[in-house]
């Protein structure tokens, strides 16, 4: 009698299962107990000899690729042996390289926890994944997975991560890039410094003083707020960060305590206060303010 | 195909401003940086700077910062240079160019704009 | 600035013939990343730059295997084994190691 060994599907992709059979065209199982082995070059593979001349194979790789057949042996311990046939394991190159972030959008709060997620559209086997920093790339990461998802992970994110980033893909067909995405890292405003600036030492009625705030940190736009003991002198905006100012034509009703405060929409902070008094020098004619 | 069409020649003024657009199609706009090239007639090229449309964010030479402004359209995948104050030297050829990350070469380039700059 | 100094700027050559040319750069282009992003292009009269050679040595794609690159850290070589017809124009080595990025003052390859 004569034994054969099917593969199906003959030609696999890897990740995917096989079906391994043992065929005996001249004889029906019901006409003997038959045990069967299936062996892959030299080894034995699955249970060993088994009642069952069927051998499920859940998922080949490219390693997996070699020279198969199978024996049966009769009660009466007569071997029978198939022919080896071959099975090539195809390998998909990896394709559609992509890059997201989370969170999305690739805008973080500075402190916060940065993930770049590499993705493949297709591709099989042991995928390495690499991450780049800047458009002439920083290699940051490679990791090595049989799977079509990687992640890289910052987990507090600093003003110095706001740059370009992209990944690349490769499991032996030669390495694909993902496209650039670029990373914003949103920092809110430090604490402002008010700064009173006249023309003059000691400014006088009607000299225009120049409240300048300026928060040393922070992502623009800034809007800053001017207040002359707490009443709402007026705004600023500052498009680009950097600091503001604001003018004011002097009265002697502008005695007190000046503050403003920034706020980029991550949050506001208020400088502290500066106060502003007038003084009187002995045989002056007009009033004088100091702060 | 990646293609990057450039738009027509200019004559200016001197002391004048002018917008060249690069539009880009057969790729994805927003995965690939895009620099700007100048060529002066009978010159050599200079790299300008460039741009990413992802986020509009330039990067420039120092040499053509205050000259130079770049910006990009993701809606219409074009991206375009504007030169201000316009003297005779910027008479030149200005070239996009697409940069390829990792391999990082220029594969794909506009096919130029000569800008005049002539009373 | 990096100065790219290219030589010769004029190549007379003839068709069959090898052809050499020499870019320098005026200090190590090798990148804080360890590569070295130099690159040679080709522009013909009338037409955008062409890359040719990308990394110092590897040809770009569609390129014939007549030209070749090599070089390190400040001297770098463009060579044609048998030039053609064809592959006249202006030769120019970029830099792209350190920003701001410059190119060589360019080549002209003219058939003797």
């Known amino acids: 009698a004569e034994l054969f060994l099917i593969a199906s599907p003959s030609h696999p992709t890897e990740g995917s299962p096989v079906t391994l059979t043992c065929k005996m065209p001249f004889l029906q199982s019901s006409d003997a107990q038959f045990q069967f082995c299936f062996f892959r070059d030299t080894r034995a593979l699955g249970p060993g000899w088994s009642s069952s001349p069927k051998l499920q194979i859940a998922a080949m790789w490219k390693e997996d690729t070699g020279s198969y057949w199978c024996e049966a042996q009769t009660m009466a311990s007569k071997v029978l042996r198939s022919r080896r046939s071959q099975i090539n394991v195809h390998r998909v190159p990896v394709a559609d390289v992509s890059l997201e972030t989370q969170p999305p959008g690739g805008q973080v709060m500075e402190g916060d926890r940065l993930v770049l997620i590499c993705s493949v559209a297709m591709g099989t086997g042991d995928i390495t994944f690499l991450w780049y920093k800047g458009a002439v790339g920083l290699n940051l990461q490679s990791k090595t997975q049989r799977s079509l998802t990687a992640e890289y992970e910052i987990p507090s994110v600093r003003e110095s991560d706001a740059e370009q980033y992209y990944c690349v893909a490769e499991n032996g067909y030669g390495p694909s890039p993902s496209g650039l995405v670029s990373i914003t890292v949103r920092i809110p405003v430090s604490r402002p410094i008010l700064m009173l600036r006249a023309p003059r030492a000691q400014a006088a009625v009607e000299d225009v003083l120049e409240l300048h705030c300026e928060a040393l940190r922070g992502s623009p736009p800034i809007l800053y707020w001017f207040y002359h003991e707490d009443i709402t002198l007026g705004s600023r905006s500052a498009p680009s960060g950097g600091g503001a100012s604001f003018n004011l034509s002097l009265t002697e009703e502008h005695s007190g305590n000046y503050s403003c405060e920034a706020n980029n929409g991550l949050g506001a902070q208020r400088s502290e206060a500066v106060t502003l008094n007038f003084t009187v020098p002995t045989g002056a004619r007009s009033n004088h303010l100091t702060s | 195909q990646v293609q990057l069409v450039q738009s027509g020649a200019e004559l200016v003024k001197p002391g004048a401003s002018v917008k060249v657009s690069c539009k880009a199609s057969?790729?994805?706009?927003?995965?690939?940086?895009i620099h700007w090239v100048k060529q002066a007639p009978g010159q050599g090229l200079e790299w300008i700077g460039w741009i990413y449309p992802g986020d509009g964010n330039p990067k420039y030479n120092e040499k053509f910062k205050g000259k130079t402004t770049l910006t990009a359209d993701k809606s219409t995948s074009t991206a375009y240079m504007e030169l201000s104050s316009l003297r005779s030297e910027d008479t030149a050829v200005y070239f996009c160019?697409?940069?390829?990350?990792?391999?990082?070469?220029?594969?794909?380039w506009g096919q130029g704009t000569l800008v005049t700059v002539s009373s | 600035d990096v100065v790219m100094t290219q030589s010769p700027l004029s190549l007379p050559v003839t068709l069959g013939e090898p052809a050499s040319i020499s870019c320098r750069s005026s200090?190590?282009?090798?990148?804080?990343?360890?590569?070295?992003?130099l690159e040679w292009y080709l522009q013909k009269p009338g037409q955008s730059p062409k890359l040719l050679i990308y990394k110092i040595s590897n040809r770009f794609s569609g390129v014939p295997d007549r030209f070749s690159g090599s070089g390190s850290g400040t001297d770098f070589t463009l060579k044609i084994s048998r030039v053609e017809a064809e592959d006249v124009g202006v030769y120019y080595c970029f830099q792209g190691s350190h920003v701001p990025w410059t190119f060589g003052q360019g080549t002209k390859v003219e058939i003797k």
């Open positions: 200090q190590s282009i090798v990148h804080s990343n360890g590569n070295t992003y």
């Open positions: 057969g790729y994805t706009f927003t995965s690939y940086n």
């Open positions: 160019a697409r940069r390829i990350h990792y391999y990082d070469y220029f594969d794909y």
